[in-house]
């Protein structure tokens, strides 16, 4: 059994959330990863997911009877989504700490915006770009 | 050219962003994105990258000036980055809108979330999945 | 002050097998990663194995796995890398040095705390 | 593989400048940190570069670290060459499992 398992039993006593009706009115992931198939798409999913726990851990990082769960629960995450890669870490941290409501958070944002926009189709920095530009080009011809 | 460059360009002037005095201190984005290579790997950042630019533009809906230059970029968001995939648009929108600190949410959110790690490794889903599961434990057999 | 002090060397047999320890200490331990390095005499910086501070995962050089076995003990702040079917190519200096904490996206530097080493001597 | 490849062997004189680089065989350099160590004869390694350019504390800002993505390397440059800066130097990253891997180490001989 993974480590994480246990801790999760134990953020469950302390967030009461156990019982059967918190699963009422559906679920807030699980119905989604259901519906992702292809890793690119999972990971699009799981970036969100993953950036919440750690929001919510963060919230409840000075409470001392889950800390050592919190701890486990947020390493196995590093291990099995960042690949124990810090730098992968970091740069998701970095991203995930930006204030949309920084006047020169929104500038820089904007001012990166065409190269941002430029690099997200799939495949885009790779050799499989001129056919990928190709098919945007035939998609638009139509319209 | 793309319709978004001409439409980014009227944001770079609304929000004063065209100077080079904005690229002072470093990038936000496109030196992150320099880093990853492999798909999945910039997915898990691009992800966090198009919910910040979602998040801006929403604080930004009513101002009339640049309406149509956010709708162009948000359209052409949804082409390149969700492959025009309304579905998986919606359900990016339903991850990022989930409020931490809603009790409901956090209880939800601790309900699945031994279901949730069990699928963060990459292949977790796939035909991989025994390889990966043998190797994990193989990891941790000699506890 | 952070220390890692490395015990348990010696000479051993061709096919023999050895247990070296690290005990740790000035530190959240358990929090931790620790890998194992080694220095053959003269030669380069060779990593051996790692384990992860709570959840224990193993993980190891390809060509060592399948010989080489490392574990922890938190409560006692204490690491240890079980070898078995010895070579002269193990004969080295094994360094148990201090990880990431990965549960603190601000973690001091990896491989920044290293022990003074243990000197382990496979000869018939 | 993913071997990070150095040179055996570097030698200069005191007060000039050496670049000791560090040549990743597979994988992106980017992708991954890199460290780099001073260990001098008989001496526990040292890291004086972390996380691809930062300097811990008490390592003079002679001795810096950066990364270069055309030519998939990393480098140190140490500059003022000191005597006490006759020693091996070793750069570490990662492979793809993320496993620690090391170059084959740089002696720096000052003349």
């Known amino acids: 059994q993974d480590p994480y398992v246990k801790e999760a039993e134990n953020l469950k006593k302390y967030f009461n959330a156990g019982h059967s009706d918190v699963a009422d009115n559906g679920t807030l992931f699980l119905g989604i990863l259901k519906n992702w198939k292809e890793e690119s798409d999972r990971k699009i999913m799981q970036s969100q997911i993953v950036s919440f726990y750690f929001k919510l851990f963060k919230n409840f990082k000075d409470d001392q009877s889950i800390q050592k769960s919190v701890e486990t629960i947020k390493e196995d995450m590093n291990v099995k989504f960042f690949n124990s890669n810090k730098k992968k870490r970091d740069d998701f941290e970095k991203l995930t700490n930006y204030s949309v409501t920084d006047l020169n958070v929104q500038r820089k944002a904007i001012h990166e915006l065409i190269q941002v926009m430029a690099e997200l189709s799939p495949a885009a920095k790779t050799g499989k770009r001129k056919r990928s530009q190709m098919l945007f080009r035939g998609r638009r011809a139509s319209q | 050219q793309d319709p978004y460059v001409k439409e980014a360009e009227n944001l770079k002037k609304y929000f004063n962003a065209g100077h080079s005095d904005v690229a002072d201190n470093g990038t936000l984005f496109l030196g992150i994105l320099k880093n990853w290579k492999e798909e999945s790997d910039r997915k898990i950042m691009q992800s966090q990258i198009v919910s910040f630019y979602f998040k801006l533009f929403k604080n930004f809906k009513d101002d009339q000036s640049i309406q149509k230059s956010v709708e162009t970029i948000k359209e052409d968001m949804n082409v390149k980055f969700f492959n025009s995939n309304k579905k998986k648009r919606d359900d990016f929108e339903k991850l990022t809108n989930y409020s931490v600190t809603d009790l409901n949410v956090q209880r939800k959110a601790i309900h699945e979330l031994i279901q949730v790690m069990a699928e963060l490794s990459p292949a977790a889903k796939t035909g991989k999945r025994k390889r990966s599961q043998m190797l994990f434990r193989g990891r941790r057999a000699s506890q | 002050e952070v220390q890692l002090v490395e015990s348990g060397g010696g000479l051993v047999k061709p096919g023999d097998s050895l247990t070296v320890s690290c005990v740790a200490s000035?530190?959240?331990?358990?929090?931790?990663?620790i890998h194992w390095v080694r220095q053959a005499p003269g030669k380069g910086l060779e990593w051996v194995a790692t384990?992860?501070?709570?959840?224990?995962?193993?993980f190891y050089s390809d060509s060592l796995r399948g010989r080489f076995t490392v574990s922890r003990d938190n409560a006692n702040n204490s690491v240890y890398l079980h070898m078995s079917s010895l070579r002269g190519e193990d004969t080295a200096l094994y360094y148990c040095v201090r990880g990431y904490d990965h549960s603190d996206s601000n973690s001091a530097a990896d491989l920044l705390h290293w022990g003074r080493g243990t000197l382990v001597t496979v000869s018939s | 593989n993913f071997m990070l490849t150095q040179p055996h062997s570097v030698s200069e004189s005191p007060g000039k400048t050496i670049t000791i680089s560090c040549t990743r065989g597979?994988?992106?350099?980017?992708?991954?940190?890199v460290q780099w160590y001073q260990q001098r004869p008989g001496g526990v390694p040292k890291i004086v570069v972390f996380?691809?350019?930062?300097?811990p504390s008490g390592v003079p800002d002679r001795i810096s670290g950066s990364i270069d993505t055309s030519t998939n390397s990393a480098s140190l440059t140490i500059s003022g060459l000191q005597t006490e800066d006759e020693a091996d130097y070793y750069c570490q990253s990662y492979d793809d499992a993320n496993h620690v891997i090391f170059g084959g180490g740089t002696k720096l001989t000052v003349l």
């Open positions: 384990i992860s501070g709570r959840t224990k995962y193993m």
């Open positions: 597979r994988g992106y350099i980017a992708s991954y940190y």
């Open positions: 000035g530190f959240t331990f358990s929090n931790y990663f």
């Open positions: 996380e691809d350019t930062q300097r």
